[in-house]
Interface confidence: medium
């Protein structure tokens, strides 16, 4: 029950996280104009990964896309790539984790298969979250660098007369959304990995001993792996082997609370 709850919660947390990463990537407020010491107050400039917007005091907003790669910081391309990779990995992870959920039955999928899928999706969520956090952090670093450069260059011109005031930009809402979303996706991924450990049927450490068990405690019966995992007609919770026809490496025996050796 705890495993199912952990897996389900991990899925939900990751789902919220990935939705947040998508939202952050699409948002225009990655950087917002710092209004300190700005002589023209009727307009407010903010910028995203894809376009730059200007909002007037009247509320009118105009946005223009970055239709050229020229003039764009190289780091912006890296941030875009990180966010997109994060979204793609997260989306694939969600798809995989849906089929891995313990509460969803798909045919006769084994617990071991579900465990592997849970682990895979968990790793994908972790990498997705790290990509988002890295992307947002790179952009934030770019902003901080630009802010202090702008501050240093704020007053330039001839004869002490202010000619140009470089606009300073501060952290926009999208950065905080991205950090939180990346963190949630990361946490969700960790939860999925933890759930995977509970889902995986533990391999017994005494397989060799099982083969030398006394005759009265083991019923030899055909049925193979199907029987040994409870899908067959074995109702007495006893281990069933297929007559020892397979090698020790081929046969997986799983302990239960009713196993006695």
């Amino acid at each position: 029950m705890a495993v199912t709850a952990c897996q389900g919660l991990g899925f939900v947390v990751s789902l919220i996280g990935i939705a947040g990463i998508i939202a952050a990537t699409c948002m225009d407020q990655w950087s917002t104009q710092d209004l300190y010491n700005n002589p023209v107050t009727a307009v407010f400039n903010y910028q995203g990964l894809w376009r730059s917007c200007v909002r007037e005091s009247s509320g009118f907003t105009e946005c223009r896309g970055y239709f050229t790669l020229l003039g764009l910081p190289a780091m912006l391309q890296a941030v875009r790539a990180l966010m997109i990779v994060g979204i793609v990995l997260g989306a694939i992870g969600l798809l995989v984790s849906i089929f891995a959920l313990k509460c969803i039955r798909i045919g006769s999928m084994e617990d071991s298969a579900k465990a592997n899928m849970t682990l895979t999706s968990g790793i994908m969520f972790i990498v997705s979250g790290l990509c988002a956090i890295a992307g947002v952090s790179v952009f934030a670093n770019m902003l901080v660098t630009n802010f202090w450069m702008s501050t240093a260059n704020m007053y330039t011109g001839m004869g002490g007369m202010v000619q140009t005031v470089q606009t300073r930009y501060t952290f926009g809402a999208a950065l905080f959304v991205g950090w939180v979303a990346g963190g949630l996706t990361l946490i969700g991924g960790v939860m999925m990995c933890i759930a995977c450990r509970g889902l995986a049927p533990e391999e017994t450490n005494y397989k060799a001993v099982s083969y030398h068990a006394s005759g009265h405690s083991v019923a030899y019966k055909p049925g193979g792996f199907k029987a040994s995992t409870g899908f067959g007609s074995n109702t007495k919770n006893k281990k069933i082997y297929d007559g020892g026809a397979r090698t020790e490496d081929e046969v997986q025996s799983y302990p239960s609370k009713h196993d006695y050796v």
Partner: nanobody, 122 residues
């Protein structure tokens, strides 16, 4: 490089009128807003009026009803029509423009002109 050049200043009698112009030239992707500031002798720079690209205007209380700001987007030019001038309007008038000179991030700047002197005296 973007340049702002003011013109139209001069000597005028109290109650008279003047029209100031500010022309922006250079590598301009878009002028988002333009404003007029003034600096009286021995005083700090004071806000007068501003106008956005869509024509929304704002004025300082001291000039409301007397000054009118306008702009010609096609010519990248800002105007300030000053009527009913008073002695306290004597100052160097500066033009400021919030400009995005090129398509890209962190390119926006606020540019200033060199100023034009307006003297109101009888």
């Amino acid at each position: 490089e973007v340049q702002l050049v003011e013109s139209g200043g001069g000597l005028v009698q109290p109650g008279g009128s003047l029209r100031l112009s500010c022309a922006a030239s250079g590598s301009i992707y878009r002028i988002n807003a333009m404003a007029w500031y003034r600096q009286a002798p021995g005083k700090g720079r004071e806000y007068v009026s501003e106008i956005t690209s869509t024509g929304n205007t704002d004025y300082a209380d001291s000039v409301k009803g007397r000054f009118t700001i306008s702009r010609d987007n096609s010519k990248n030019t800002l105007y300030l029509q000053m009527n009913s001038l008073r002695a306290e309007d004597t100052a160097v008038y500066y033009c400021a423009a919030f400009i995005i000179p090129s398509v890209g991030m962190f390119t926006s700047r606020t540019y200033w002109g060199q100023g034009t002197l307006v003297t109101v005296s009888s």
